[in-house]
């Protein structure tokens, strides 16, 4: 066991052009906080996949209000470390996600007060007990500077926090088979600790935190006896130490539950969920009382002292039905965002997202501008999962790769002739007209409808439209 510690040193604009706009304003002061998510190994995982090693949230930082006209400085940070305790061994290689969040301090009743400002991610190797490692990560125009380390919690020591040290019982030497704990030479290695709950009779371990089964036992904690009866052909058995890799015929095959009961498999056999009024292993007995335990999912049974009087199940939150056998419709709260479809699977809620959205609650608007370049100085505009390019003058098409013909729309009025030009278009006006688009008639006396022609420009000259 141990703790991963993260120290944020600064968060502010990165070097180079395009300094980000301040996240706070005089009208909407805000403060920052950080979230760290750790995953074991070096796998590239989605941002929303579980933080298997742990996660932590910082305190809120000091309130910050932008000074109008001033460039965005390094923003004020929360005090203290972010600490992620880990219970088992430190994996040595890990992936991290650090998110910078902004909390707005305006009147936010009825809507979330925070938004994600930046997210950085990386994969690192790190030995527990080592010095602080420094890092700089950039997210868009923002830069995050931070340090991190992993340290073991006593009595654990070592680069993975798997060796356990205890003070010596005798001054001169450690017990049989146990070495001194470097660098703590006055302490001794303690015996291995298997996975919590590992059966002392049927399980053993060669590495801390594992649980290996003796022959004839299986399960994560070696508490389940191996049954060979379900390992018969045609599906076949496997070795006795691991139990059956491929199950035999299912215990619910043919539904052994009578009177409308529903069957579910259990590790050893099957279980019938009986309708009200029936009980027994196969729902074969009628005349239910509270003594028969008719209320499911922790429901409280009231009345029904004898078979002729009715019982009532008072259901715990989340369950309903005469026997507390039904789940409440949690989808009625509409937890899925952005038009996602809610599915209540019993053990969890799932959202089926519309195109352009992702995440467990469809909360992520897929950034279709990511990795998509608009050519010739165009800028990418995203929305609703689609992207389009806003093209610079003179270019068009989906990615601004096509040269636009500025004359295609016939912009020159009154019979003027259009010429494409590198900076736009030029109209050569017909006699009697002038202006950038030949829109102004020249008066018969030679005076134009404009206040005056610029020096050196005669009515009838081509007018450049910039």
């Amino acid at each position: 066991a141990g703790v991963f510690e993260l120290q944020i040193h600064s968060f502010g604009p990165g070097p180079g052009p395009g300094a980000p706009r301040s996240p706070c304003s005089a009208r909407l002061p805000c403060r920052l906080f950080f979230r760290v998510c750790l995953k074991p190994g070096l796998s590239e995982e989605a941002a929303e996949s579980p933080c298997a090693l742990g996660a932590a949230l910082s305190a809120r930082g000091p309130v910050y209000t932008e000074q109008p006209g001033a460039p965005a400085p390094d923003l004020p940070l929360p005090d203290g470390l972010l600490q992620v305790p880990f219970r088992d061994a430190w994996p040595g290689t890990f992936s991290f996600i650090i998110e910078t969040w902004r909390e707005e301090l305006g009147d936010q009743i009825g809507g979330p007060a925070w938004s994600l400002l930046a997210r950085v991610a990386g994969r690192r190797r790190l030995a527990a007990g080592g010095p602080w490692a420094r890092d700089i990560q950039r997210a868009g125009a923002w830069e995050l500077r931070f340090s991190y380390r992993a340290r073991c919690e006593p009595p654990a020591v070592g680069t993975a926090c798997t060796r356990l040290c205890r003070p010596r019982s005798a001054p001169s030497r450690c017990g049989p088979g146990l070495r001194p704990c470097a660098p703590l030479e006055d302490e001794c290695e303690a015996p291995l600790v298997c996975r919590a709950g590992c059966s002392p009779e049927h399980g053993f371990c060669e590495q801390p935190g594992e649980c290996r089964c003796l022959e004839g036992w299986t399960g994560p904690l070696c508490t389940v006896p191996v049954s060979t009866s379900s390992c018969l052909s045609p599906r076949g058995p496997s070795s006795a130490t691991t139990g059956c890799l491929v199950p035999g015929p299912g215990p619910c095959d043919g539904n052994p539950c009578a009177n409308g009961g529903s069957c579910s498999e259990t590790p050893r056999s099957f279980e019938c969920t009986c309708p009200r009024g029936f009980y027994g292993l196969r729902c074969e007995v009628s005349g239910v009382t509270c003594a028969d335990g008719p209320c499911f999912n922790g429901g409280l049974c009231v009345g029904g002292a004898d078979p002729d009087s009715a019982y009532i199940c008072h259901c715990p939150p989340g369950f309903q039905g005469s026997n507390c056998e039904k789940r409440v419709d949690r989808c009625s709260l509409q937890p899925c965002r952005n038009g996602g479809l809610c599915l209540d699977l019993g053990h969890a809620l799932r959202c089926r997202c519309r195109a352009g959205f992702a995440g467990p609650r469809c909360e992520h608007d897929l950034d279709d501008c990511a990795g998509r370049a608009c050519a010739n100085g165009g800028t990418c505009v995203e929305g609703g999962g689609a992207h389009r390019c806003s093209c610079a003058l003179g270019f068009g098409g989906r990615d601004c790769r096509e040269r636009a013909d500025p004359c295609a729309a016939r912009p020159c009025a009154h019979g003027g002739r259009c010429y494409a030009h590198f900076s736009g278009l030029v109209c050569a006006c017909a006699p009697g007209y002038m202006g950038a688009r030949c829109e102004f008639p020249v008066h018969p006396d030679g005076a134009s409808a404009l206040p005056a022609a610029p020096p050196g420009l005669r009515p009838g000259d081509p007018q450049r439209y910039l």
Partner: nanobody, 120 residues
């Protein structure tokens, strides 16, 4: 682990008012959706009012114009102001929340319920 603690239930006469509150605490990163359900004896549990995942408010037809839901994000608390109460509003009122935990998982939680009784 996340706890939802309700308060404010009690007995009231028809036409009276009550204000329920529900405070969420624990390993919460954010609250995605939060609201109130109720269950009358022998009836199915139904949504009364809630803030959906998109942040909009939703009310059961039977309470529109009488009940108002509000929330205080800083306190992770949701309130239900109940006015013009009727006998048919008698039920156990449960707070419910769809919560994003610190580990990024989403879980749905229920409070233990608070009894509201409307009788002359």
């Amino acid at each position: 682990e996340v706890q939802l603690v309700e308060s404010g239930g009690g007995e009231v006469q028809p036409g009276g008012s009550l204000r329920l509150s529900c405070a969420a605490s624990g390993s919460i990163f954010s609250i995605n959706a939060m609201g109130w359900y109720r269950q009358a004896p022998g009836k199915q549990r139904e949504l009364v009012a809630g803030f959906t995942g998109d942040g909009s408010t939703k009310y059961a037809e039977s309470v529109k114009g009488r009940f108002t839901i509000s929330r205080d994000n800083a306190k992770n608390t949701v309130y239900l102001q109940m006015s013009s109460l009727r006998a048919e509003d008698t039920a156990v009122y449960y707070c419910a929340a769809d919560v994003q935990l610190l580990n990024t998982d989403y879980e749905f939680y229920w409070g233990q319920g608070t009894l509201v009784t409307v009788k002359p």
